[in-house]
Interface confidence: medium
Amino acid sequence: TDCLSLPSFENAIPMGEKKDVYKAGEQVTYTCATYYKMDGASNVTCINSRWTGRPTCRDTSCVNPPTVQNAYIVSRQMSKYPSGERVRYQCRSPYEMFGDEEVMCLNGNWTEPPQCKDSTGKCGPPPPIDNGDITSFPLSVYAPASSVEYQCQNLYQLEGNKRITCRNGQWSEPPKCLHPCVI
């Protein structure tokens, strides 16, 4: 009824002293390798000469921190970031940061990055939309409170507000141009 060698699980490491023989009812706890996190039970139990339980280690690391327009990363760059690792941004002059200066790797996903907005409140060119265009000639800079309108290409219908406005260096939400069959 004893168990012999410990089972191996991907990216899981048995804790404690390894033994040749484990008695019935004995438990062994596993821990996960760097970048991995235990999903569910972390131990196996010796029952009737067999090990029961299946510790599962899942990858919780992140790669490629989000790109922030008009900003650069000031913390050390890594090929892989463990969960809990933070990355700090800085805005290029003359842009000002709005939002959390850092993103964090949270169980495989990056938290929401900040935005770097023109401190004068001006906006860049309006965002492009699929199957639609703005009705005026696009400028490189727009004054605060200025607005533009979108129109859809033939056979597409506009969903949302056709007019967007520049507020605090940000354009309001642009509309969508949808094919009639998906409305």
């Epitope: 933070r86 000002e96 940061m97 709005f98 939002g99 959390d100 200066e101 850092e102 993103v103 964090m104 949270l106 996903n109 938290t111 929401e112 900040p114 935005q115 940000q170 939400e173």
Partner: antibody, heavy 117, light 107 residues
Framework: QVQLQESGPGLVKPSQTLSLTCTVS????????VYWIRQHPGKGLEWIGV???????EYNPSMKSRVTISKDTSKNQVSLKLSSVTAADTAVYYC???????????WGQGTSVTVSS | DIQLTQSPSSLSASVGDRVTITCRAS?????MHWYQQKPGKAPKPLIY???NLASGVPSRFSGSGSGTDFTLTISSLQPEDFATYYC??????????FGAGTKLELK
């Protein structure tokens, strides 16, 4: 360990400015943003504003004209000023640390403020 | 602005019950946070970004959902779980918003 502690007068007269201080320990204000949140008696939570680690601020649009949040990093303090208060500003005021994704991980115990003449 | 609607607003349950609280956003959002608050105390984080358990929170709590519908589940209610629960969202283009709360009471 991480701690946040709100302080300020418990009673403020209508039309005056409410001033509260959040003193933090266990972390640096140069690394973390701090939020102010309030809770009216028997009601839900309402976001007032946030000051980010770099010093920029964001406010609830419904209070923006009356709110100022600032900080003194060397004193580990964040302050909240709310002008032209009325009885509707009577609430428990909390400060909380930013965790990421606009979530809060550590909160102060709250300070109760009554607006009354 | 995004509105968060929690349901139910109050809920009576017994120790050992499985409880689900729903938070519905008025438009699609990327994630939701959940907090627990007991009378006279500050809120305490439970779930970050829809499904990530906050530090020190028992595994009987779980979060799920995407788009407009998010849920907080307590798999087996314990006496200390009777409290008010709030969902919360914030994006770069919308103010930080809390749901109105769900009060979980002992049946």
């Amino acid at each position: 360990q991480v701690q946040l502690q709100e302080s300020g007068p418990g009673l403020v007269k209508p039309s005056q400015t409410l001033s509260l201080t959040c003193t933090v320990s266990g972390f640096s204000l140069t690394n973390y943003g701090v939020y102010w949140i309030r809770q009216h008696p028997g009601k839900g939570l309402e976001w007032i504003g946030v000051i980010w680690s770099g010093g920029t601020t964001e406010y609830n649009p419904s209070m923006k004209s009356r709110v100022t949040i600032s900080k003194d990093t060397s004193k580990n303090q964040v302050s909240l000023k709310l002008s032209s208060v009325t009885a509707a500003d009577t609430a428990v005021y909390y400060c909380a640390r930013n965790f990421g994704n606009y979530a809060m991980d550590f909160w102060g115990q709250g300070t109760s403020v009554t607006v009354s003449s | 602005d995004i509105q968060l609607t929690q349901s139910p607003s109050s809920l009576s349950a017994s120790v050992g019950d499985r409880v689900t609280i729903t938070c519905r956003a008025s438009t699609s959002v990327t994630y939701m946070h959940w907090y627990q608050q007991k009378p006279g105390k500050a809120p305490k984080p439970l779930i970050y970004a829809s499904s990530n358990l906050a530090s020190g929170v028992p595994s009987r709590f779980s979060g799920s959902g995407s788009g407009t519908d998010f849920t907080l589940t307590i798999s087996s209610l314990q006496p200390e779980d009777f409290a008010t629960y709030y969902c919360q969202h914030r994006s770069s283009s919308n103010p930080l918003t809390f749901g109105a709360g769900t009060k979980l009471e002992l049946k």
